[in-house]
């Protein structure tokens, strides 16, 4: 059996026979039976700074008679390097400083061997050396610098940010890794919860407009914050974010602007600006006109970039009617925070005085455009109509009229410079141009720079001055074996005129061809006519071609008519009536040509 000198044991194992006994800095509360050998756990202090090797424990076999016949050997984690054994005495020592944060546990095996035979006298025994933690690591914050925001005017105790520090020491043993947070800089504005690292506001009514940035320094100290604990610090940059706790304010109570009466609607005539100590959307301002005789005449719009109110013209101004307007303009915050309404209304008003300046205005025509009509058969110097323009200024300067020749290059029209009467200077033709678009200029006689222009749209009215004509050139054929009253061609006519009641054409054979004709004309009363055969059978050898003169008349006043010729060839046809051949002798022998007789 083996025994271990009690003087070498620090843990007070039960007095029990063991095959191989280990004694030293051991604890037996974790000991258990592994196979039939004893399994022990030893504790060594990390970062040992003594001059000698650190003593671990002693290995002893009760077969050791002290005569040097046994040899103790060590194997496993760090054996022979970190841990050495006196092979004669079994004393184990640590040769180097051990760092729990590098390796917290070492597993080793011990054996007693007979020197002479080289055989083990006891079975191998496994044991653990656990490195005991000391407080050699300071808490380290997860960030060197934190940034956080909190709304201004927040209640005391409002959450700002949570800081966290970690400590590499053993969190389960002692307080080496138990971190406590405290505030080194940043009071009385902020506080930190000692256990959680949560930073909260500590002062009422912190006003961003007074101070926006705060630098808070937080300390994390281990050992539960007790004396001798290690510490680390971090900086927290806290920015107060804006809330709408300031109303807009006009820097002056009255503004005055001038604008010429000629300013068209939409013209900006001046800018006003209310100031707001807030920022972002809390400093956004909406402007409105709330009162004054200029309520209908002017508008105010907000410039989103500059937060200015731009006064603009809404309706046309007239110096001759009103020379001064007064407006009441209001500036308000669109985004109001209800909890600050007790501070008063989040709006302000100012008076805006607008002076209208007189402008020498150009003549004004009585209409924006004139539409006139004239018959196309009008003689030269026929009056079409007249235009009127007046100087709107109080002076009522006289006006002269002229035609803008760029719009009447052919000089078809003229104007009386004194009274504005428009008359023709050339003959018109509706069939050439239906509408004439010209521009008339009115110029102040005393100030030729002041002129206005107006468009004139002159419609040329139709007169029946064109005769109807065939829609196309008609050349047809008739079969030799044709029957009487057979339709061989339909005729259509066209007319350049545009009568009010529409075209009504009539068709007939010219009087010289009407009697004894081999063909007849049938007027269909729908502006078409048909050519019909008048006899049974035609002989192409006797007469190969007929020329039919047809008179086409319109029904308008004065009646216009024309004569057109239809050529009819006589052809040999098959039994279906399809043309097979038409001799052209008639084109060669004039004797074979007939006008229909």
């Amino acid at each position: 059996t083996l025994s271990t000198p009690l003087s070498k044991r620090t843990s007070g194992f039960p007095a029990k026979k063991r095959a191989l006994e280990l004694s030293g800095n051991s604890k037996n509360e974790l000991s258990r039976s592994k196979r039939s050998w004893m399994w022990n756990q030893f504790f060594l202090l990390e970062e040992y700074t003594g001059s000698d090797y650190q003593y671990v424990g002693k290995l002893h076999s009760d077969q050791d008679r002290g005569d040097g016949s046994l040899k103790y050997i060590l194997s496993g984690d760090g054996a022979g390097d970190l841990f050495i054994i006196n092979e004669n005495t079994g004393d184990i020592q640590a040769t180097k400083r051990l760092d729990r944060e590098e390796k917290p546990v070492y597993i080793l095996r011990a054996q007693a061997i007979n020197r002479r035979t080289g055989r083990p006298v006891e079975p191998e025994s496994e044991f653990i050396i656990k490195i005991h933690d000391i407080n050699d690591n300071e808490p380290i914050f997860t960030k060197e610098v934190y940034t956080a925001t909190v709304p201004e005017m927040s209640d005391v105790g409002t959450f700002v940010v949570q800081v966290t520090a970690t400590d590499a020491d053993d969190p389960t043993y002692g307080n080496s890794a138990k971190v406590v947070y405290s505030i080194l800089q940043g009071q009385p504005y902020f506080s930190v919860e000692s256990e959680t690292g949560i930073i909260k506001t500590a002062l009422l009514n912190m006003d961003r407009e007074n101070r926006e940035q705060y630098q808070v320094v937080i300390q994390a100290k281990d050992m539960g914050g007790q004396m001798g604990g290690l510490s680390g610090t971090t900086t927290v940059n806290i920015t107060l974010t804006d809330v709408n706790d300031n109303p807009p304010r006009f820097p002056q109570s009255t503004y005055q602007f001038k604008t010429p009466e000629s300013s068209p609607p939409g013209t900006p005539i001046g800018r006003i600006k209310a100031s707001d100590a807030d920022v972002g959307e809390n400093a956004e301002i909406e402007y409105s006109i709330t009162d004054g005789e200029g309520l209908d005449m002017f508008d105010v719009i907000t410039d989103q970039e500059t937060q200015e109110g731009i006064i603009t013209v809404k309706k046309l101004l007239d110096f001759e009617k009103k020379k001064v307007y007064t407006l009441k303009v209001e500036a308000s915050n669109p985004h109001v925070e209800p909890r600050f309404l007790y501070l008063g209304p989040f709006k302000d008003s100012a008076t805006v005085r607008i002076v209208v300046e007189d402008v020498d205005e150009p003549p004004v025509f009585s209409k924006l455009a004139y539409i006139l009509q004239i018959r196309e058969d009008a003689q030269i110097n026929t009056t079409i109509g007249s235009v009127t323009a007046q100087d709107p200024d109080a002076a009522r300067n006289p006006v002269k009229y002229s035609v803008d020749r760029h719009t009447d290059m052919d000089r078809i029209f003229n104007i009386d410079s004194g009274n504005g009467s428009i008359f023709t200077s050339k003959l018109l033709d509706r069939e050439t141009l239906l509408w004439h678009n010209i521009t008339v200029i009115a110029t102040e006689i005393n100030n030729p720079k002041q002129s206005s222009r107006v468009p004139l749209y002159i419609k040329v009215l139709d007169v029946n001055d064109n005769a109807p004509e065939f829609a196309e050139f008609y050349e047809t054929f008739v079969c030799e074996k044709a029957k009487a009253d057979q339709l061989i061609q339909t005729l259509r006519a066209v007319d350049k005129d545009d009568p009010y009641s529409g075209h009504q054409f009539s068709f007939s054979l010219a009087p010289e061809a009407a009697s004894g004709s081999n063909f007849t004309i049938q007027d269909n009363k729908d502006n078409t006519a048909g050519i019909l055969t008048r006899k049974n059978g035609y002989n192409r050898h006797e007469m190969s071609t007929y020329l039919l003169p047809v008179v086409i008349s319109d029904n308008d006043y004065p009646v216009q008519s024309s004569t057109g010729t239809v050529t009819v060839r006589v052809c040999a046809c098959d039994h279906h009536g399809n043309m097979q051949s038409c001799h052209a002798e008639a084109l060669i022998h004039p004797t074979g040509l007939s006008t229909g007789a």
Epitope: E101, P104, I128, N137, I140, T142, T166, A168
Partner: antibody, heavy 118, light 112 residues
Amino acid sequence: QVQLQQSGAELVRPGTSVKMSCKAAEYTFTNYWIGWVKQRPGHGLEWIGDLYPGGDHANYNEKFEGKATLTADTSSSTAYMQLSSLTSEDSAIYYCARGMLTTGFDSWGQGTTLTVSS
Amino acid sequence: DIVMSQSPSSLAVSAGEKVTMSCKSSQSLFNSRTRKNYLAWYQQKPGQSPKLLIYWASTRESGVPDRFTGSGSGTDFTLTISSVQAEDLAVYYCKQSYYLRTFGGGTKLEIK
């Protein structure tokens, strides 16, 4: 020989949660931190967080706070990671590893493949 | 938050050549109390889990071949492989553990 045995591959639907395990053997479970690392296909390693099973102390990467929850059962020497509100971005291999805070992860699990797909 | 930047994003070398890769942090990783730089290097081979090579910027993890060396302090760190072997084909990641943990984007090492 230290061993970390991770649970098998998971195929889950978006919006659901998953809990994967990491069973430790051949060392004292409560003496070391267990870290979790994410690796998307063709990408690098991304640290999720660490847990010290001896006292349930945990550190998280800010990016994974609210996404990952680390726990441990010391009686079975098993660490767990639960991932919630899953999206396709969470599809990856997740490794558990043993280590100390300031040194490194000296032993790694074989990885659990998570696929999030509808 | 600390940002880790690795360069180059990829490189190809022949077996036996020396290779260096860089890792920069947006702030110092040196802890003046412990006199340590809290930076680690990992190797991830295709289809495998990552493996710890170096911690505290220069301490080699047990079992890691001595051809892998970590150096640097503060914000600039280097991983050197003195004589690249075919089995070193992998992506190498640096990781800070000063404020929590952050990985770099990785450097892909290919063998020509």
